[in-house]
Interface confidence: low
């Protein structure tokens, strides 16, 4: 009831709690002398379902049959309406619509750890929408019985608060859960189990790792477990990996040797436990242990490349470059690189340790046969040295790769293609594709990049250290024994018109023609590989179209003659530069008047 109902009553038949789909009869009746003053025939009783009128009747009582009520609670209110007054609330009733409980399914019980307590879970089935009581019963040997109840509408878990002990690990226990509400009851199938079936060990703790003689090949993992544990499973992975290595061990007694760890790698280790070979469940995984394995001496060999530069008639500069070993090859922190330079005929050798760099430059005589060896060292030893005979990499013209091209391939990639050299292509042992940012000054400090390609390949995709709007000088070397041939090309991954034109710095007269000199456009304003320069000129104060001369771009060229100017005429000259994407804006303007005689 929702109030004291002084004026009348609302009765519900057959019950306030009904099965979904049932019909209910609702009666509203006034108590004596509670109708409208004077005119009892004018009593108008109105039945509301929540706030909506569903029926009315003149008189002392109202009957209404209601069907199709939804699951859950529906509120009915009866009101009296008299002439010239507001409706008065008489009485009300709540009707609860639900279903009988379904049979609880998948009853399972567990005891966490040997000292834990037994707790069971089950699936309730569909919601009854009614107050439902669950009773969990556990019966064991010697007619022992435990019972626990919960009256929560969403109950699907109960803890008995009792501890099963391993005195008789094979003794049977039976659990059953019963659900009861106003519309019916249902019990689960019984679940029968032993101590070994339901005890789930606590996860191992106090995990440690030891490396005998600081060697990764002699590694033992230690941990502590509950007393009855028979089985363990270990999982471990490098910290930067998502995939676990898994090992199952029996009767490990808190220790296991690991044989396949990689050196100088941070690993994550976890352990889980179980009491019986085929009964019971695995514990949760332990907390992670993180540990770094010791170093081992490097494996693999460095990828070494070099550049020669002529200094004068007797000396040459050798620049050596090498790539870092991969983590799996370095097997530790590389402390230094050892470079040995040797003159092969005279036997003179020079060794140097390089720290913090992957390049080395030295000056050697142009005479003699020179070789270098480079190795990487960590705290445990050195890699095998990479040996290279220094030769003129571009000397063999017949070994030069043909038709070298460089084309943009997506973002910050350049596809380099070539044709094998004219000389017997089968003589090629490997190709090396080398690239570096193009700097007009031929700056030797510009980083060098390279990759090696098998002799049957005629293309390579270069992506390392490739930036948009930068021009790269690309060389393809074909190597055969102690000979090499090379071809070069300029290429960029992305280009647009240069941001500025060349700056004319001087115009000089030479035998009736002029020589224009200019400063290179700064690299960051070239916006790719320059293809051409244009020199424009027109008579000062003239409205005529300018004339122009277009010259192919050469890295080292910074001047050009023009011989079509008339003497004693003042001209205005300026320059632009072009990439494949278009022409730059004008550079500075210079005026010039040719003093010489007319042709």
């Amino acid at each position: 009831k929702i109030d004291a109902c002084k004026r009348g009553d609302v009765t519900v038949k057959p019950s306030h709690v009904i099965l979904l789909g049932s019909t209910v009869n609702i009666t509203c009746s006034l108590k004596p002398r509670q109708g409208c003053f004077h005119y009892s025939r004018r009593n108008k009783l109105i039945l509301y379902k929540f706030d909506r009128r569903i029926n009315f009747h003149h008189g002392h009582s109202l009957n209404s049959q209601v069907t199709g009520l939804p699951l859950g609670t529906t509120l009915f209110v009866c009101k009296l309406a008299c002439i010239n007054s507001d409706e008065i609330q008489i009485c009300g009733a709540e009707i609860f619509v639900g279903v009988a409980p379904e049979q609880p399914q998948n009853l399972s019980c567990i005891q966490k750890g040997e000292q834990g307590t037994v707790a069971c879970t089950w699936e309730r089935g569909r919601d009854t929408h009614l107050y439902t009581e669950y009773t969990l019963q556990l019966s064991g040997p010697k007619n022992l019985t435990w019972q626990k109840q919960c009256k929560d509408i969403y109950c699907d878990y109960l803890d008995f608060g009792i501890n099963l002990t391993p005195e008789s690990p094979e003794s049977n226990f039976t659990a059953k859960v019963t659900a009861v509400n106003s519309l019916g009851s249902s019990s689960s199938l019984p679940s029968t189990f032993t101590f070994l079936d339901i005890v789930r060990p606590l996860p191992p703790w106090d995990i440690r790792i030891k490396f005998q003689k600081a060697s990764v090949s002699r590694c033992t993992l230690y941990w502590r477990d509950e007393g009855l544990v028979l089985l363990n499973r270990l999982r471990y992975r490098p910290s930067n990996s998502r995939l676990w290595n898994m090992v199952n061990v029996t009767k490990a007694k808190g220790r296991h040797d690991l044989l396949d760890l990689k050196p100088f790698t941070e690993y994550e280790f976890q352990i889980s436990s179980k009491l019986h070979l085929y009964k019971g469940s695995w514990s949760d995984w332990s907390e992670s242990l993180r540990a770094q394995t010791p170093e081992e001496e490097p494996t693999g060999m460095l990828d070494v490349w070099y550049m020669k530069r002529h200094i004068d008639y007797s000396r040459q500069q050798i620049s050596l470059f090498w790539k870092n070993l991969s983590v799996s090859e370095a097997r530790g922190k590389i402390l230094h690189y050892q470079v040995t330079l040797q003159e092969l005929t005279g036997g003179k050798a020079m060794t140097q340790n390089i720290t913090g760099h992957t390049s080395w430059t030295t000056v050697i005589p142009r005479t003699g046969n020179w070789a270098v060896a480079v190795s990487a060292a960590n705290s445990k030893g050195s890699s095998l040295p990479t040996r290279i005979n220094i030769m003129n990499l571009c000397e063999a013209g017949l070994l030069a790769p043909r038709q070298v091209s460089a084309n943009s391939e997506g973002m910050d990639n350049i596809l380099v293609t070539w044709q094998p050299p004219r000389k017997d292509p089968s003589a090629v042992q490997e190709y090396v594709v080398e690239w570096r940012e193009l700097h007009p000054g031929g700056d030797t400090q510009v980083p060098l990049n390279w990759l090696r390609s098998r002799p049957y390949n005629v293309s390579a995709l270069i992506s390392e250290n490739i930036k948009s709007y930068i021009c790269y000088e690309i060389r393809v070397y074909a190597l055969s024994g102690d000979q090499g041939g090379c071809s070069s090309i300029l290429g960029n991954s992305k280009h647009k018109a240069p941001l500025s034109g060349p700056h004319i710095n001087a115009i000089t007269e030479e035998k009736g023609s002029i020589l224009i000199s200019w400063n290179s456009i700064p690299v960051q304003e070239q916006m790719g590989c320059l293809l051409h320069y244009r020199i424009y000129w027109k008579e000062r104060d003239s409205n005529s179209q300018p004339q122009l001369c277009e010259i192919p771009y050469r890295v080292s060229q910074n001047s050009h003659p023009i011989n079509s100017l008339q003497p004693r005429v003042t001209y205005v000259l300026w320059m632009t530069a072009l990439t494949a994407a278009g022409e730059s804006s004008h550079g500075n303007e210079r005026e010039f008047c040719l003093q010489g005689k007319a042709n």
Partner: nanobody, 127 residues
Amino acid sequence: QVQLQESGGGLVQAGGSLRLSCAASGRTVDSYAMGWFRQTPGKEREFVAASWGGGSTYYADSVKGRFTISRDNVKNTMYLQMDSLKPEDTAVYYCAAGPTYYSGPINDNWEGRYDSWGQGTQVTVSS
């Protein structure tokens, strides 16, 4: 000098497409300026499109947005893709080439800009 040979002309209906080719021999033309001109009987030769060695392209106003000039420097060939053809595009089409380094007016329709010419190929657009 460079020898030039046009091909790809023919009869096509208005709204159709043709692709003209100009094959160069004698030397590589990757740094040359190359152009297309056309001529109808009794009229002067008319500039159509040009491709300079630096990669710049230029078009006559009458063909902008319909014609595309391109070149394949490996094959030493220049192309003119002609789409949405109109009856007034009917003409003999000539291919021309000239060294990019030259002294002369900047406007590309100046015929003196080019010193090598092909024999021409007939394009007829019927309505």
